[in-house]
Interface confidence: low
């Protein structure tokens, strides 16, 4: 027993004064704690602890399970211990079959002996199987057998503690080692969708998938810039021994506009952390926004093709789309398709293909789209550029020469006089009157221009040219004059 100098508190003394005691099963255990300040006896073996406030610990008929460490403590908190082995030929080992080992750490197979005098205290594989070659262990009769540096490959290893008693090998109950893997990488996290768009009152539900080697990975949903605890539900699976998957589902049963924001799924283990985010946008009602991909005023030459193209955002999904011209709906010549195949897509494209446009096909082309909440439209003003066409060229009774031309853009009419029989006219003649005849008519289609000159100004034989032109092209008509004496005679005009 320990000795200390007088004046200092000393640990209690135990009788018998031994560090170890061996008792046969059925015999008495009698331990006396000698200390004026005795407080209690404590018995410990494996996970079990018992206490006794009597200074004499008596067990009348000792059982194997009374094997363990008996500690006497005094009021100063000082203690002394004796280890008692209760030798029971029928029960050589005390066992706690729960056996967990952390990868790369040591773990204790808890099978303390009830008889310290046996030999070959060691581990054996079940059913005669050998232990892994690299498995190292250290036996301790009072605690069990420590497996050094547990490997992941030892998971589900079946073991017995073994000892030789009176020449026979005795095995304990079997142990199954469960290895808790060490984290050697950060968790793998993914989210069901990167963004969500909802209307007020709709349910928001998003699932984060966390994958790691074991279930002790920590995970949580967080709202960025907020400390509010979010409601989550979990499902989990073990796909094999070291392949764990958890699904953490975050739900807001009736989303509001102020729920909009970024939500982060965060996971960490002892190696490190990982996160993934999803964005929620909640709108008070649905919407449609249309973006023309070409100018809404379109000029196209006669006989050419043009494509009217819009992109539009629609939420919820568009239900009805149509292209209209002159109160008529196109049944073909157009297509409508999503901009992306992503299920979060809200952007769409619509194209109207106009081919070999005629001058009469100018006008307003309208795209209409609607969903369950709103409808929207956009109009394209299509102008067909046409080369001027001379509709009439006449000598009026009042002696005026009149030329009427139609085209788009608005044609300009110039007059020329050619002396003699020359077809190449250079001398220009100023018109007496110019009018745009349909300026107040429909805004699309050809514009009609009328121009007149006074023929009395011409004193010689010759040709008068009426030339109508615009950006697209030009057209001419001719008047021939011949004088017989004093009479002026108009020859029929020609183009």
């Amino acid at each position: 027993q320990p000795s200390v100098s007088p004046g200092e508190p000393s640990p209690p003394s135990i009788h018998p004064a031994k560090s170890e005691l061996i008792v046969r099963v059925g015999n008495e255990i009698r331990l006396l704690c000698i200390d004026p300040g005795f407080v209690k006896w404590t018995f410990e073996i494996l996970d079990e602890t018992n206490e006794n406030k009597q200074n004499e610990w008596i067990t009348e008929k000792a059982e194997a399970t009374n094997t363990g460490k008996y500690t006497c403590t005094n009021k100063h908190g000082l203690s002394s211990s004796i280890y008692v082995f209760v030798r029971d030929p029928a029960k050589l080992f005390l066992v706690d079959r729960s056996l967990y080992g952390k990868e790369d750490n040591d773990t204790l197979v808890r099978c303390p002996l009830t008889d310290p005098e046996v030999t070959s205290y060691s581990l054996k594989g079940c059913q005669g199987k050998p232990l892994p070659k690299d498995l190292r262990f250290v036996p301790d009769p009072k605690a069990g057998i420590t497996i050094k540096s547990v490997k992941r490959a030892y998971h589900r290893l079946c073991l017995h503690c073994s000892a030789d008693q009176e020449g026979k090998s005795v095995l304990s109950d079997k142990f199954i080692l469960k290895v808790r893997p060490a984290f050697k990488a950060v968790p793998v996290v993914s989210v069901s969708k990167a963004s969500y768009l909802l209307r007020e009152g709709e349910e928001f539900t998003v699932t984060c998938t966390i994958k790691d080697v074991s279930s002790s990975v920590y995970s949580t949903w967080k709202r960025e810039n907020s400390q509010t605890k979010l409601q989550e539900k979990y499902n989990s699976w073990h796909h094999g021994d070291f392949n764990y998957e958890r699904q953490a589902t975050l739900t807001i049963s009736s989303a509001r506009v102020n729920d909009s924001g970024v939500f982060m799924c965060y996971a960490n283990n002892t190696f490190g952390s990982a996160n993934v985010t999803t964005t929620l946008e909640v709108v008070d009602k649905g919407f449609i926004n249309i973006f023309p991909m070409i100018n809404t005023t379109v000029f196209v030459n006669d006989g050419e093709n043009v494509d009217l193209i819009v992109e539009y955002e629609a939420f919820p999904k568009p239900e009805h789309q149509q292209w209209i011209y002159m109160n008529r709906t196109f049944t073909d010549k157009w297509e409508d398709y999503p901009k992306s195949e992503n299920e979060s897509n809200i952007r769409y494209v619509s194209e109207l293909h106009l081919t070999r446009l005629k001058g009469t096909e100018g006008g307003t082309y309208t795209f209409l789209v609607s969903n369950s909440d709103v409808n929207a439209s956009i109009a394209f003003n299509v102008y067909v550029n046409t080369k001027p066409e001379i509709l009439t060229y006449d000598r009026l009774v009042n002696g005026m020469l009149q030329c009427v031309a139609a085209g788009f853009p608005e044609p300009t009419i110039d007059w020329y006089f050619c002396p003699g029989t020359e077809q190449r006219c250079s001398a220009s003649v100023l018109p007496v009157d110019v009018q745009t005849l349909n300026a107040s008519g429909p805004p699309f289609g050809k514009l009609v221009v009328q121009s007149s000159i006074d023929s009395s100004a011409f004193k010689h034989n010759g040709t008068v040219e009426c030339k109508a032109y615009n950006d697209v092209g030009k057209t001419s008509a001719y008047f021939n004059f011949a004088f017989k004496g004093n009479n002026k005679e108009q020859i029929h005009p020609h183009t």
């Epitope: 073996i45 494996l46 996970d47 079990e48 399970t65 079959r97 079997k174 199954i176």
Partner: antibody, heavy 122, light 106 residues
Framework: EVQLVESGGGLVQPGGSLRLSCAAS????????MAWVRQAPGKGLEWVAN????????YYLDSVKGRFTISRDNAKNSLYLQMNSLRAEDTAVYYC???????????????WGQGTTVTVSS | DIQMTQSPSSLSASVGDRVTITCRAS??????LNWYQQKPGKAPKLLIY???RLQSGVPSRFSGSGSGTDFTLTISSLQPEDFATYYC????????FGGGTKVEIK
């Protein structure tokens, strides 16, 4: 599916014998302690006997010691209870139960059979 | 031998009620106590082991507490399927059961 199915019950006269069997499936039978628990008509549960997984250790309720023998055949995944010198008070439903440890020599019964009825009457 | 005494032997309760059943051991059994549920004509079913550990698949409305000699099983909100007889069992030295508590519909 983890399952225990008892058989062998019946009507027997006082002093007679019966042998109950329990067929285990769906788990590693040879790695578990097994027990018999009984329930007299209208009464509570009473532990009767148990056996360790190799079959080398057995324990009995005092009132059945010397009359009942528990045994097992790990190759056949079967548990047995040989009941001799039967008495009227042995009348009960007999359940086969799988025992498991938590901590040191601490038991609970986590899987039970549906029971077999033993009636001892003249 | 260790004797186990349960109380009450029977009780009447309604769906949604909080129900408490107690079990007393004749000597200390540390935390070595289990609870079972049994319905008429059926085998017992393990609910709780080692005083408070919920067996896999058992609803969280069941909970256990206590240590030494006094133990409690609590059903936080009684459901229709919970009407049954409940037994405690000690696993400290050999194995013995309490007399049972029958939970009936009020």
């Amino acid at each position: 599916e983890v399952q225990l199915v008892e058989s062998g019950g019946g009507l027997v006269q006082p002093g007679g014998s019966l042998r109950l069997s329990c067929a285990a499936s769906g788990f590693a039978f040879s790695g578990y302690y097994m027990a018999w628990v009984r329930q007299a008509p209208g009464k509570g549960l009473e532990w009767v006997a148990n056996i360790n997984y190799p079959g080398s250790s057995t324990y009995y309720l005092d009132s059945v010691k010397g009359r009942f023998t528990i045994s097992r055949d790990n190759a056949k995944n079967s548990l047995y209870l040989q009941m001799n010198s039967l008495r009227a008070e042995d009348t009960a439903v007999y359940y086969c139960a799988r025992g498991d440890y938590y901590g040191t020599t601490y038991w609970y019964f986590d899987v039970w059979g549906q029971g077999t009825t033993v009636t001892v009457s003249s | 031998d260790i004797q186990m005494t349960q109380s009450p032997s029977s009780l009447s309760a309604s769906v949604g009620d909080r129900v408490t059943i107690t079990c007393r051991a004749s000597q200390s059994i540390s935390s070595y106590l289990n609870w079972y549920q049994q319905k008429p004509g059926k085998a017992p079913k393990l609910l709780i082991y080692y005083t408070s550990r919920l067996q896999s698949g058992v609803p969280s409305r069941f909970s256990g507490s206590g240590s030494g000699t006094d133990f409690t099983l609590t059903i936080s909100s009684l459901q229709p399927e919970d009407f049954a007889t409940y037994y405690c069992q000690q696993g400290r030295r050999l194995w013995s059961f309490g007399g049972g508590t029958k939970v009936e519909i009020k």
